[in-house]
Interface confidence: low
Amino acid sequence: GWVWNQFFVPEEMNTTSHHIGQLRSDLDNGNNSFQYKLLGAGAGSTFIIDERTGDIYAIQKLDREERSLYILRAQVIDIATGRAVEPESEFVIKVSDINDNEPKFLDEPYEAIVPEMSPEGTLVIQVTASDADDPSSGNNARLLYSLLQGQPYFSVEPTTGVIRISSKMDRELQDEYWVIIQAKDMIGQPGALSGTTSVLIKLSDVNDNKPIFKESLYRLTVSESAPTGTSIGTIMAYDNDIGENAEMDYSIEEDDSQTFDIITNHETQEGIVILKKKVDFEHQNHYGIRAKVKNHHVPEQLMKYHTEASTTFIKIQVEDVDEPPLFLLPYYVFEVFEETPQGSFVGVVSATDPDNRKSPIRYSITRSKVFNINDNGTITTSNSLDREISAWYNLSITATEKYNIEQISSIPLYVQVLNINDHAPEFSQYYETYVCENAGSGQVIQTISAVDRDESIEEHHFYFNLSVEDTNNSSFTIIDNQDNTAVILTNRTGFNLQEEPVFYISILIADNGIPSLTSTNTLTIHVCDCGDSGSTQTCQYQELVLSMGFKTE
């Protein structure tokens, strides 16, 4: 049978021929009667065999990392007979490893992000090197990691390549670090090969800085004429953090927030001071407010960095503006009796200059020929007033500063003209009626009513009577209905168209005013021939339109 030991050949041997071992048959007695042959991949080129002795040689330098084993076949032949002495057999030549490969970091470039102020022990990233040498051959591929650059902030686990934080870092002092990691094979023993890699470690921001005002005092001005909502200036705080951690909100401390407000411009991170309520130079010409600033987003666990909000003081000076006169009242209402003589007193208006110089005021009444006003604001009548023509006057009073005639104010003035009893009552219309010749006594021939142009504090009440002459004339009589109407009745039976075709009755109407006024009003009564049926009339005036609503024939 075949006799051999396991064959090993070291890689990277530089000799032209390296003896590996011997193949032989146990039938070989050493008399050179057998011939050994080598077959298979590498036979004759990489490996040769001494045909007489069976010694095998490597004639090329080998690289285990390229090929770690060779499978060959061996034959042994009896030279005399040409026959095989042993059956053909396979055998293996293993290429043994030497430490000829340094560790290599394959996933470069390495970059990691870790929050600033992360505690010691926080995992940052794991770097991994690879060694092409045989991991089963001693320590050739056993790696040990170490930190060449990055102390004291980082550490690396020697066997895993895990990089951890070893000291808290503040992004605001330095926002990125280059860490250099070395991997050594042979677990760092002498003769080890090494490789290095660089890791860029960036610190992400956490909200560990509160915003702080750059200035402890701001001076702003605002005109007293500025409307509410006016921006009067900006204030600015600075935050060493970045992004949303630097977003801030400005506010005014509660006690100071009546007149001014601060809104935040989230694009510029400025605080805009806004006028919340109108200011008045003459009332208060300067203000002091305290503003504070806080971050917009603060997770609870970072509140320890934000316990005391930064504050600043804002002094606001109010600028004086020449203001128009100010009336004591928003409008005035006065009363005056009609028929009062020209120059009668109506009322007094008053306006003052709100500014400190207190300019004298001049007054005028617009669009009025009925009233006058003097420099003291006293209003008088310039004509006699008639309530029955105009009961109310809607006017405008203008006040102008003497020293600056552009400063003008106007307010409404309402004058009510009060009634006096200066009109007697009179017929509400012209009355003309008729009576039939054959009319009986007590027959109603007309109802009359009256009107009075005066205004009555109480209800108007009118009193109706016949004149003294007509009272003595017994043809007609009057009854006062006590409701501001009266009826005219016949006071006899029968009238004669030929003898007396028309009667003119004088009626007295008195009002209940003080003093009472009376008027005399004439009622015309025509005598008509009414016929038996009373449906046809013949009167003196054929075209007379009677109160009944039809014409005479």
Epitope: P119, P299, E300, Q301, L302, M303, K304, T307
Partner: antibody, heavy 120, light 107 residues
Framework: QVQLQESGPGLVKPSQTLSLTCTVS??????????WSWIRQHPGKGLEWIGY???????FYNPSLKSRGAISVDTSKNQFSLKLTSVTAADTAVYYC????????????WGQGTMVTVSS | DIQMTQSPSSLSASVGDRVTITCRAS??????LNWYQQKPGKAPKSLIY???SLQSGVPSKFSGSGSGTDFTLTISSLQPEDIATYYC?????????FGGGTKVDIK
Amino acid sequence: QVQLQESGPGLVKPSQTLSLTCTVSGGSISSNDYYWSWIRQHPGKGLEWIGYIYYSGSTFYNPSLKSRGAISVDTSKNQFSLKLTSVTAADTAVYYCARGVYRTGAFDIWGQGTMVTVSS
Amino acid sequence: DIQMTQSPSSLSASVGDRVTITCRASQSISSYLNWYQQKPGKAPKSLIYAASSLQSGVPSKFSGSGSGTDFTLTISSLQPEDIATYYCQQSYSTPQAFGGGTKVDIK
């Protein structure tokens, strides 16, 4: 080894004030790295955060308590306390005190809890 | 306020099984998510902080992952001593909120 221990009455009458104290041993309550919290658990239910306090006195509360809660700290005694006013039967629960880690907000150490019953 | 929703509310698994519990936040909470284990009659115990960091002394069979709104607690090989209720908790903003809990037992 930091330990937390709750103490206080186990029975409180309705409308009265519940008062609990948590004593911290094995470490200082004045540490910058922690805050001190109260958490409760109604019978058979989940956990409800009540509020917490920093050693400086800054407090945060759960709005669901509608301003009934007040947490205070006594650094000289290494204690912090909870007062809950106007209690009702709905406040019956196991009350835990716990230590919260600033950087993460995690409650890493808890007291064993104390059962408080609100009943007349 | 941020709401935390845990699922499932309860589960049964065999010894050695891999168990996964999920927790969802109603808005992004970055990595401010913590996991707790509570055994009957006991106080809760911290397992995981900052979404994935293992609390000191906790076995490595417990792991956490996720960020933003979706988070997971995994028990790689369930053992009888893991029977408990597990809670998630957000510490991003007040009021700090816990999930409703997941009760784990063994088939």
